[in-house]
């Protein structure tokens, strides 16, 4: 089905807050079309917090969205603003910090049973084999039992991001999944696209690392929606 | 048509050492995970480890880490599961099946290891 | 690990019948299970997937639901070529840890 191919993704068991590898997990879409479960483990804080002007949430950190600076304000004039905390008041789950989703107007916390990872891949395969029924592939992030053994290095098999060792992330090539690095500042991200894709994402990408989100980049603003380039910039 | 052809029969003896193959076809080799199961006689399945073959990364069950060595050949599309010196325990049936999103879906036919003094 | 408890270890069903085998995961696995059908003398074959799939070529005789802790694979109607030991297999966390077995005959 296609929430399959939607979920197909998802990196499972990322870091701790505060602990393993950079933990900065992006957004990722949940089992219902249309409805974003914002996933990761780290509160971004409002200092030095600089105006990012954006039309949409997926332009914004993975701890920030896409709204009006202003209650009633002109819906014109957006800017990514922080993430709201648990307990506070939201409209949608884009509002809430990762780790929370929006239930009844509260950010509640999502206790580890949503979808997390910023993963969908730039390379896109519809496929016509003996599998082109999209087996379900879906990924859900839980904590992890105690380790049983060494963590993997890159290319190592995986099933889920604690496998794999500090600075890496298990994540989707062609068929399987293995430990591949947290991107760096300036290298290339995936946002996902809450509408989704018809086709198959068959490699993946990390999230970005410690204190990077995955922005569109400033200059491709102008750009088609469907070509525009995210990196993984500084807060 | 995807075929996993694994080598045949072997009878050895405790101190031994002994390397089974899995030769692939019918589908691209560095695409997917290989896994290697045992099935002791009339037990359960157990799965002992895994190799992608794109940059030869494994892992391993930690109970049969450090006891057999999972490798690829990526020329010959051929994976390998090897002991360096083989116990009784090790007697059982041994698949190697090939990872789809998770799942193992095509296994080849099974490689009997009988170990006997 | 995650311990998988196959049950019934046995169970005999008359052709038409429907047959039911049980996994419970000592973890919460989502709907991360895999169900796999093993007649004598031959490997595995892989019947329903992660998110309770149907594989291609497997008929809608063979079903399976459940996500969590507690799975179920349905057979039914069940037929004489049936007969085979089931497992179910989770894939949520390494390591990859099969159930105990369940054999079917039928009566």
């Known amino acids: 089905t296609l929430n399959s191919v939607l979920n197909s993704n998802a990196i499972k068991n990322l870091p701790p807050p505060l602990g393993g590898a950079a933990g900065h997990p992006g957004s990722a879409v949940s089992a219902a079309p249309g409805i974003l479960y914002p996933g990761g483990n780290k509160y971004q804080t409002i200092d030095n917090y600089q105006p990012y002007p954006c039309a949409e949430d997926e332009e914004c950190g993975t701890d920030e969205y896409c709204a009006s600076p202003t209650r009633g304000g002109d819906a014109g004039v957006q800017i990514c603003l922080a993430c709201r905390k648990r307990r506070k008041r939201c409209m949608r789950h884009a509002m809430c910090c990762p780790g929370n989703y929006c239930k009844n107007g509260i950010c509640v916390s999502s206790d580890q049973n949503h979808f997390r990872g910023e993963i969908e891949e730039t390379i896109t395969e519809s496929f016509g084999n003996d599998h082109s029924t999209l087996d379900g592939y879906s990924r859900r992030t839980t904590l992890s039992s105690k380790m049983y053994h060494t963590k993997g290095q890159e290319g190592s098999v995986c099933l889920r991001s604690s496998d794999c060792a500090s600075g890496l992330c298990c994540a989707r090539h062609f068929w399987s999944k293995i430990c591949k690095p947290v991107l760096k500042e300036g290298q290339v991200c995936t946002k996902h696209r809450r509408k989704g894709s018809h086709g198959l994402e068959i490699f993946q990408r990390c999230y970005c690392g410690e204190g990077l989100s995955c922005r569109i980049q400033k200059d491709h603003h102008q750009a088609s929606n469907s070509s525009r380039l995210h990196t993984c910039q500084r807060h | 048509e995807v075929q996993l052809l694994q080598s045949a029969a072997e009878v050895k003896r405790p101190g031994e050492s002994l390397r089974i193959s899995c030769k692939t076809s019918?589908?691209?080799?560095?695409?997917?995970?290989m896994h290697w199961v045992r099935q002791m006689p009339g037990k359960e399945l157990e799965w002992m480890g895994g190799?992608?073959?794109?940059?030869?990364?494994?892992s391993y069950n930690q109970k049969f880490k450090g006891h057999v060595t999972i490798s690829v050949d990526k020329s010959s599309s051929t994976a390998y599961l090897q002991w360096s010196s083989l116990k009784a325990s090790d007697a059982a049936m041994y698949y190697c099946?090939?990872?789809?999103?998770?799942?193992?879906?095509?296994w080849g036919q099974g490689t009997l290891v009988t170990v006997s003094s | 690990d995650i311990v998988l408890t196959q049950s019934p270890a046995s169970l005999a069903v008359s052709p038409g019948q429907r047959a039911t085998i049980t996994c419970i995961t000592s973890?919460?696995?989502?709907?991360?299970m895999n169900w796999y059908q093993q007649k004598p003398g031959q490997p595995p074959k892989l019947l329903i997937s992660?998110?309770?799939t149907l594989r291609p070529g497997v008929p809608a005789r063979f079903s399976s639901s459940g996500s969590g802790t507690d799975f179920t694979l349905t057979i039914n109607p069940v037929e004489a070529n049936d007969v085979a030991n089931y497992y179910c297999?989770?894939?949520?966390?390494?390591?990859?840890?099969f159930g105990q077995g369940t054999k079917l005959e039928i009566k």
């Open positions: 099946a090939r990872d789809w999103l998770g799942a193992m879906d095509y």
């Open positions: 019918g589908y691209s080799f560095t695409e997917n995970t």
């Open positions: 190799i992608n073959p794109h940059k030869g990364g494994t």
């Open positions: 973890t919460d696995i989502d709907d991360d």
């Open positions: 992660e998110g309770n």
């Open positions: 297999l989770q894939s949520d966390n390494l390591p990859y840890t």
